[in-house]
Each structure stands twice: as C-alpha cells, then as structure tokens.
C-alpha cells in the first residue's frame, strides 16, 4: 500500500495473507469458514511451492494470539483466468479446515447486486504489499481510503486504454495505492467487499495509471458454484 | 490537548487574494488531516477539501478546485488555505479541522471570518 | 454530489426532553454518517461519527442511529448547553456533503 497508514490491528478480521513457503506472497479475504478470495495470478509462479493462507494477522512476523497459518485443500483459479491478461483475475483458496472464527477472524460480506459502485465512493484497501517504490515490505497490515473513479475516465487513452471491463473497476491511484503484494487483497466500500485487487505488473502511485480491481460482484455465479 | 488556531478576522479587497492560517498544537501535526470547510452568514457548512500535512497530498471538492490552495508548513505546525480572485460571494467564515482520515472532523478551529469589500 | 437533508429547520424542546433529529441522504452512504453541534458563538463540535459512535468526552445522552440512507441524532435529557445548531455529514463519497443543520431552541 503506498501512502497509507498502518491499520488498526485486527480491525479487518476479513484480512488474509496468501503465503508461499512461509513468506508473503498476496492478500485475500476470507468470504467463507473455508474459504478465502484472492488474485489468480498470484498462484502463477507457486507449481512447486507450499501454499498456505494466514489469518488473524496483523503483523506478519510477532507472534499473535488470533494468528493462525492453515494449509490450502484446494486451489480454484477462474477458469478463464489467463498469464497475460488482467481479466477473470480471481481464486478462491478451500482451506484444510473451516477457519476458527473470532473477533480477529471473521469472513466479510461481499457484493452480489452487479451494479457499478458510485464514482467518488472511498473504499478501504489493505494489505502487507510494498509501502514505497524502493520496494519496502511492512511487517504490520497497512491501508489506504480510495476513491472509485469513473470506468470512461480509467478507459481513457492516456489511463488504461480501454482495457476496464464491465467486470473490473478502477480507484484513483496519485500517490496513494495498491501496490505489489497487495494484489488477492479486498476493496472494501461500505463495509462490503466489492473487488479484488488484480495482480497485474501496473506502476502504482501514478495518477494516470488508475488501480485495478476485479469486481466481485460479476462473478456471483462462479464465487457460489465453487463454494456450494 | 488538540488545539486549533485561527485569526478572528480578515478583511479584504475584491479581486485579490487571502491566505488563511490554521496553526496546529497539541498533537503530531503530520498524524492529523486537515480540512476547511466554508459557511456563508446563516448558511450551512460546505467541505471545500483537505491535506495530509504528511506529504501535502490534497483532495478538493471540484466546486473549489479553482478558488481554494491548501498548503502547509510542517516547521511550524501550520496549515493555510489561499483563496484567490475574491468576490463577494467568498465571504463567510472558514474553519480549519483536524483528522478526518475517515471523513470525520475530530477537532475544529474557531474560523476565520472573511469579508470581501471594496 | 450526495445530496443531505435535514427537513427539520428548527426545533423547540423544553428542558428534560428527549430530542431527535433526522437526516436523510440523496443515496445510501452505508453508515459513513457524522454529527456535529454548532454553538451560537460558531464554536463546532465532532458528536457522533459512523452513524453511532460517541466521539471522546461527548456527553452519553447523546447517540445516532439509522442505516441507509436515514439517519438521527437524538438527545436524551436535554440540557441548556445543548443549544446549538446540528449538522449531518456523510463521508461515504468525495466531495464530502453537509445537512442545512436543524437549530434547537428551547421552550
């Protein structure tokens, strides 16, 4: 998250971190006792790693009595999810067992109704992505207030050239951001999760180059088909 | 404890400009936001916009964008909005008031009234 | 812009009563709702912000409450040093918008 600040600690009990070999890889959210959401791409480069999802957490590293790491029984990309494209950028994580639930472990409502959220709405994204461009990680969970901007203006030449979808949505990104390893992680506006963040290579921090999020809410039907 | 201070009063010519200060104690300055907001005489509050003393990153309500600049000086816990090309319709009383990072505005000062006359 | 509207003016309440004032948004802010009070002498207060949460060292007998898009302030046992003017402000969607503000008076 660039120009963020460190988040309340386990004020977003949602929050997850998809883990490759024991380090941070992406964000996610978990949406189900047994399920967490997050980015297809981040899977890309993981054929033979250990996947795991930490819940629980708000710093990665200091021992945390809510923290728990659980090993991931399935992993289901969108089966229309491509390496070279930002679209369909979602997965869903089935964890070894259903997540101990708690005050710092609590899945999040998301959007079903598939409606645009309103240009100008702030929404809260967070994650333990790099927090500036030397590439510095934060041990704590940090977040950012967003607001939505228009798909036209995202589609613009100079902007994102058309690439925004019906199924994506964009926040304004000068200065403050998602960034790289927040990709997976939620866009939350009025306390319901309404995208995710894609994990596509996007300069961040740039104004003219808006963030990306996959929007939840297109893909209902998939999100409950995996889950039933 | 959080304390905001503004001048009481200013009163200038139309066509020209004003700069509106709001000095800050009490608090880190950089760990608060800060935002003015506008009241004409027995009129309601409007939000013109806010700074992150941080990294004077802005974000203005559009119907000010070309009216109102937020600024601040760090050195001296002090955060300033110039209004330019001054017109009758500018004068009101202006607040400054800290935080708001989630859109409240924890603490006020007690504003500055400003009169546009020739 | 979200429009805000309190259609309450101005209200009259004697000493004791139980007060409230509403607020309705021109769209559903989800509970990014505050309150201030305004007194006479233009000094403003943060009340109450999301909808329902006393700020610091804000008497108990006030609270809000409402989701969507209506929403009230109410004052429990009002006290002279409740007389002042409120305003609603939703902070759901930039630019950041204003309620007219209800005065109270008392009786």
């Known amino acids: 998250i660039l120009g963020g600040r460190e988040a309340e600690a386990h004020a977003r009990p949602y929050m997850a971190s998809v883990q490759l070999n024991g380090a941070h890889l992406c964000g996610g959210v978990l949406v189900a006792e047994q399920w967490v959401l997050s980015a297809a791409h981040c899977l890309e480069d993981a054929a033979d790693g250990k996947v795991q999802v930490l819940l629980g957490a708000h710093s990665l590293s200091q021992p945390e009595p809510s923290k728990r790491l659980y090993d991931v029984l399935r992993a289901v990309p969108h089966p229309d999810s491509q390496p070279d494209t930002i679209d369909h950028d979602l997965l869903l994580l089935q964890l070894s067992e259903k997540a101990t639930l708690g005050p710092a472990v609590r899945p999040l409502p998301w959007q079903r109704v598939d409606r645009d959220v309103a240009p100008g709405t702030l929404c809260d994204v967070a994650g333990w992505g790099i927090v500036n461009h030397a590439g510095r990680r934060p041990d704590s969970l940090q977040h950012v207030l967003l607001p939505v901007l228009d798909r036209a203006t995202c589609n613009r030449a100079t902007h994102h050239d058309g690439a925004i979808t019906e199924r994506l949505m964009c926040a304004e990104s000068n200065r403050r951001d998602s960034c790289k390893g927040d990709s997976g992680g939620p866009l939350v506006c009025g306390g319901v999760l309404e995208g995710v963040v894609t994990s596509g290579s996007r300069v961040c921090g740039n104004a003219k180059k808006p963030g990306i999020y996959t929007r939840v809410a297109s893909y209902a039907a998939w999100i409950d088909s995996v889950l039933a | 404890q959080v304390q905001l201070q503004q001048p009481g009063a200013e009163l200038v010519r139309p066509g020209t400009s004003v700069k509106l200060s709001c000095k800050a104690s009490g608090y880190t300055f950089t760990s608060y936001w800060m935002h003015w907001v506008k009241q004409r005489p027995g009129q309601g509050l409007e939000w013109i916009g806010v700074i992150d003393p941080s990294d004077s990153y802005t974000k203005y309500n559009q119907k000010f964008k070309d009216k109102a600049t937020l600024t601040v000086e760090t050195s001296s816990s002090t955060a300033y909005m110039q209004l330019s090309s001054l017109t009758s319709e500018d004068s009101a009383v202006y607040y400054c008031a800290g935080n708001g990072y989630d859109g409240s505005m924890d603490y006020w000062g007690q504003g500055t009234s400003v009169t546009v006359s020739s | 812009d979200i429009q805000m509207t309190q259609t309450t003016s101005s209200l009259s309440a004697s000493l004791g009563d139980r007060v409230t004032i509403s607020c309705r948004a021109s769209?559903?802010?989800?509970?990014?709702l505050n309150w201030y009070q305004q007194k006479p002498d233009g000094t403003v207060k943060l009340l109450i912000y999301?909808?329902?949460r006393l700020h610091s060292r804000v008497p108990s007998r006030f609270s809000g409450s409402g989701s969507g898009t209506d929403y009230s302030l109410t004052i429990s046992n009002l006290d002279q040093e409740d007389i002042a003017t409120y305003f609603c402000?939703?902070?759901?969607?930039?630019?950041?918008?204003f309620g007219g503000g209800t005065k109270l008076e008392i009786k």
């Open positions: 402000q939703q902070a759901n969607t930039l630019p950041y918008t």
């Open positions: 999301y909808t329902s």
């Open positions: 769209q559903d802010i989800s509970n990014s």
